[in-house]
């Protein structure tokens, strides 16, 4: 399988980790989150050509069938393979609380 | 979050399990698999509108940012949440072997 740097579609076009800066307003969190005011959201973006970061056998099957009938079977999709935790300071009825979220920031990506 | 039957885009258009019939030739397996000759491949296909089968907080963030900058951040993607095992009868140097694959057939789907 191709590794993360060997993108046949051109530099940066294949599935990889991107960082998108977002405010609490952007995320719809302004009502319940105090901090951070801005989040560096890491997410998985990019195309998944044949064998590129294929997560498993299912991804390989999907590529094969996508090539036969692309209007029926989509190409594999670039999604998080794992996550980094993130702590949010939240508003509560009595004040504030610290909450850790384990499924918020992508850590690395694969195609499935 | 919306459940699997409440698709705002119209019946059957949102993320759900589909079955696609595929031959060994379609899958590129004819050289190494003896049986089955044809596979009923279950896979996750469909759109992921806001909150539809959102897998986690990351999916919700992705929806929010996709609405703000759709050319930069793609919508969440319909992918397997779990898999069903499948047994393949494979050709070997000495004859045949039975091999179970745990990551071949999607069992149910979510958006991420």
């Amino acid at each position: 399988a191709r590794n993360g740097d060997d993108c046949p579609l051109g530099p940066g076009r294949c599935c990889r980790l991107h960082t998108v800066r977002a405010s609490l307003e952007d995320l719809g969190w302004a009502d319940w989150v105090l901090s951070p005011r801005e989040v560096q959201v890491t997410m998985c973006i990019g195309a998944c050509p044949s064998q590129f970061r294929a997560a498993n056998m299912h991804a390989q099957i999907k590529t094969s069938l996508h090539r036969l009938k692309p209007d029926t079977v989509p190409a594999p999709c670039c999604v998080p393979a794992s996550y980094n935790p993130m702590v949010l300071i939240q508003k509560t009825d009595t004040g504030v609380s610290l909450q850790t979220y384990d499924d918020l920031l992508a850590k690395d990506c694969h195609c499935i | 979050a919306r459940n699997g039957d409440d698709c705002p885009l119209g019946p059957g258009r949102c993320c759900r399990l589909h079955t696609v019939r595929a031959s060994l030739e379609d899958l590129g397996w004819a050289d190494w698999v003896l049986s089955p000759r044809e596979v009923q491949v279950t896979m996750c296909i469909g759109a992921c509108p806001s909150q539809f089968r959102a897998a986690n907080m990351h999916a919700q963030i992705k929806t929010s940012l996709h609405r703000l900058k759709p050319d930069t951040v793609p919508a969440p993607c319909c992918v397997p949440a779990s898999y069903n095992p499948m047994v393949l009868i494979q050709k070997t140097d000495t004859g045949v072997s039975l091999q179970t694959y745990d990551d071949l057939l999607a069992k149910d789907c979510h958006c991420i």
């Epitope: 046949p8 579609l9 051109g10 076009r13 195309a47 998944c48 050509p49 044949s50 064998q51 996508h66 090539r67 036969l68 009938k69 692309p70 209007d71 029926t72 989509p74 190409a75 | 379609d26």
Partner: antibody
Framework: QVQLQQPGAELVRPGTSVKLSCKAS????????MHWVKQRPRQGLEWIGL????????NYNQNFKGKATLTVDTSSSTAYMQLGSLTSEDSAVYYC??????????????WGQGTSVTVSS | QIVLSQSPAILSASPGEKVTMTCRAS?????MHWYQQKPGSSPKPWIY???NLASGVPARFSGSGSGTSYSLIISRVEAEDAAAYYC?????????FGGGTKLEIK
């Protein structure tokens, strides 16, 4: 801008073979699948097959298996189709057409001008 | 393979008229794509994924349909629209084209 350049015409003898070229420019050659399509005089379009230049994957219409062979030369961003054992039935215009397999559903986005093949003794 | 049947084979219309051409599939397809071809030229993508106009296509064109029946509509036909129009599917292997509708302007 994207361009697919094909020779205008080829005159070939029955029983021989011909290799048609399609030179791509204006995009990353390995990022688009390349289709080949046949059009006989005053007739419709018939899909021959495709090649993915990123890994040389090919896929042929059953009607053209054994007739057409698709290859690419990524160093020159050129796709080729060889047609063998030519007969008068192979006289047609042959188009190459690029296709973005990662923005589906989509159409065949860019087409060459076509090569007119005439099979005659 | 899926057979696409286009009707009518030849369509004659006067400038300003609304015209509709149809593409019927032998089995259900998810999307239909349309191409325009003028004599001596290569086909051009015209409508993709049933209803999306390709770049540069005038807004008087539209596409619709689902399942086995799809249409290309021109709200007010113009002289420059004279051409052959082909439908194409790739929901099933192999991709197939319809036989074409030739639009003539009176």
């Amino acid at each position: 801008q994207v361009q697919l350049q094909q020779p205008g015409a080829e005159l070939v003898r029955p029983g021989t073979s011909v290799k048609l070229s399609c030179k791509a420019s204006g995009y990353t050659f390995t990022s688009y699948w390349m289709h080949w399509v046949k059009q006989r005089p005053r007739q419709g379009l018939e899909w021959i097959g495709l090649i993915d230049p990123s890994d040389n994957y090919t896929n042929y219409n059953q009607n053209f298996k054994g007739k057409a062979t698709l290859t690419v030369d990524t160093s020159s961003s050129t796709a080729y189709m060889q047609l063998g054992s030519l007969t008068s039935e192979d006289s047609a215009v042959y188009y190459c057409a690029s296709y973005d397999g990662y923005s589906t559903p989509s159409a065949m986005d860019y087409w060459g001008q076509g090569t007119s093949v005439t099979v005659s003794s | 393979q899926i057979v696409l049947s286009q009707s009518p084979a030849i369509l004659s219309a006067s400038p300003g008229e609304k015209v509709t051409m149809t593409c019927r599939a032998s089995s259900s397809v998810n999307y239909m794509h349309w191409y325009q071809q003028k004599p001596g030229s290569s086909p051009k993508p015209w409508i993709y994924a049933t209803s999306n106009l390709a770049s540069g296509v005038p807004a008087r064109f539209s596409g619709s349909g689902s399942g086995t029946s799809y249409s290309l509509i021109i709200s007010r036909v113009e002289a420059e629209d004279a051409a052959a129009y082909y439908c194409q599917q790739w929901s099933s292997y192999p991709p197939t084209f319809g036989g074409g509708t030739k639009l003539e302007i009176k």
